[in-house]
Interface confidence: low
């Protein structure tokens, strides 16, 4: 069972996960170092935030926050058309409640067991948790 769980985590990290490093400010943010090689289904994403090189990260990126807080943030290349479309889609999705002023840090543990932290200026376009369908 433990082996199977470890394999499952490894697969998730290989498929979508972000190799991260701490920001230059000693841990105020996590940086994505490598883009996901696969398009991310909008279904699994609830919001996104932008990673700016000016904030101490080596590459620009869009970090998509999964609906399940137990999963690691998904890292994508902002130049990709599908990334821009997904961001637009999330922007259009009605929020279930008014976003808080500024941006709270997301303290949900990631799949890697590392605490996922938001960064200043992150976009909290929360996706409705209970759409009409299911």
């Amino acid at each position: 069972m433990a082996q199977s769980l470890a394999l499952s985590l490894l697969i998730l990290v290989l498929a979508f996960g972000i190799p991260r490093t701490q920001g230059s400010d000693g841990g105020a943010q996590d940086c994505c170092l490598k883009y996901s090689q696969r398009k991310i289904p909008a279904k699994v994403v609830r919001s996104y935030r932008k990673q700016e090189p000016s904030l101490g990260c080596s590459i620009p990126a869009i970090l998509f926050l999964p609906r399940k807080r137990s999963q690691a943030e998904l890292c994508a290349d902002p130049k990709e058309l599908w990334v821009q479309q997904l961001m637009q889609h999330l922007d259009k999705t009605p929020s279930p409640q008014k976003p808080a002023q500024g941006c709270r840090k997301d303290r949900g543990a990631s799949k890697t067991g590392k605490k996922g932290k938001g960064s200043k200026g992150c976009k909290r376009t929360e996706r409705s948790q209970t759409p009409k369908g299911p």
């Epitope: 399940k68 999963q71 759409p131």
Partner: antibody, heavy 120, light 108 residues
Framework: EVQLLESGGGLVQPGGSLRLSCAAS????????LNWVRQAPGKGLEWVSY????????SYADSVKGRFTISRDNSKNTLYLQMNSLRAEDTAVYYC?????????????WGQGTLVTVSS | EIVLTQSPATLSLSPGERATLSCRAS???????LAWYQQKPGQAPRLLIY???NRATGIPARFSGSGSGTDFTLTISSLEPEDFAVYYC?????????FGQGTKVEIK
């Protein structure tokens, strides 16, 4: 060989209950989200429910919400669908299907289906 | 929920002809989130195309998918006898997976 095999279908009276099982083999079961999809006789496909790989996230179609419960036992490589308060309109072939890319996607592997008939 | 409408309901063609099947969504579907399935009588559906344009493992090159936003297309470049079946589109963009009502491709 990657395989899903449903069982538990049969004839049940309206208001009755049934539990479907889907036995998986040939892949790391605990890595995949799984689904139930049904097809009424001569009709199209209807998604019924999904469950995340660790079983902590589930969702249901409006038509079955509150009556059906999806669950899984990763130690047994088995997916379940508990169906209560069955109605005539629940009559269908029920398929279990695996999400293609682990966390919510198209369905790449399907079982052969099990027929549920709700009739008095 | 996103409603998918497939057209035509039935397509009557001969082997060797080109088949073009349409799937229209009631609202925006991320183009990464649409699939096509083939189903033959008495069989389970089979995944043909995922992420709108990627062929699933083992699917012949005559099957191709395209489209984005709300309009998607499945094309079978030259129909083989085994291709006569019902085809369904499916979106997995929002939290409910919805299917189109199906297009039956029959022998003329």
């Amino acid at each position: 060989e990657v395989q899903l095999l449903e069982s538990g279908g049969g004839l049940v009276q309206p208001g009755g209950s049934l539990r479907l099982s889907c036995a998986a083999s040939g892949f790391t079961f605990s890595s995949y989200w799984l689904n139930w999809v049904r097809q009424a006789p001569g009709k199209g496909l209807e998604w019924v429910s999904y469950i995340s790989n660790q079983g902590d996230d589930t969702s249901y179609a409006d038509s079955v919400k509150g009556r059906f419960t999806i669950s899984r036992d990763n130690s047994k490589n088995t997916l379940y669908l508990q169906m209560n308060s069955l109605r005539a309109e629940d009559t269908a072939v029920y398929y279990c299907a695996r999400d293609y890319q682990y966390i919510g996607d198209s369905f790449d592997i399907w079982g052969q289906g099990t027929l549920v008939t709700v009739s008095s | 929920e996103i409603v998918l409408t497939q057209s035509p309901a039935t397509l009557s063609l001969s082997p060797g002809e080109r088949a073009t099947l349409s799937c229209r969504a009631s609202q925006y579907v991320s183009y990464v989130s649409l699939a096509w399935y083939q189903q033959k009588p008495g069989q389970a559906p089979r995944l043909l195309i995922y992420d709108a344009s990627n062929r699933a493992t083992g699917i012949p090159a005559r099957f191709s998918g395209s489209g984005s936003g709300t309009d998607f297309t499945l094309t079978i470049s030259s129909l083989e006898p085994e291709d006569f079946a019902v085809y369904y589109c499916q979106q997995y963009d929002d939290l409910s997976y919805t299917f189109g009502q199906g297009t039956k491709v029959e022998i003329k």
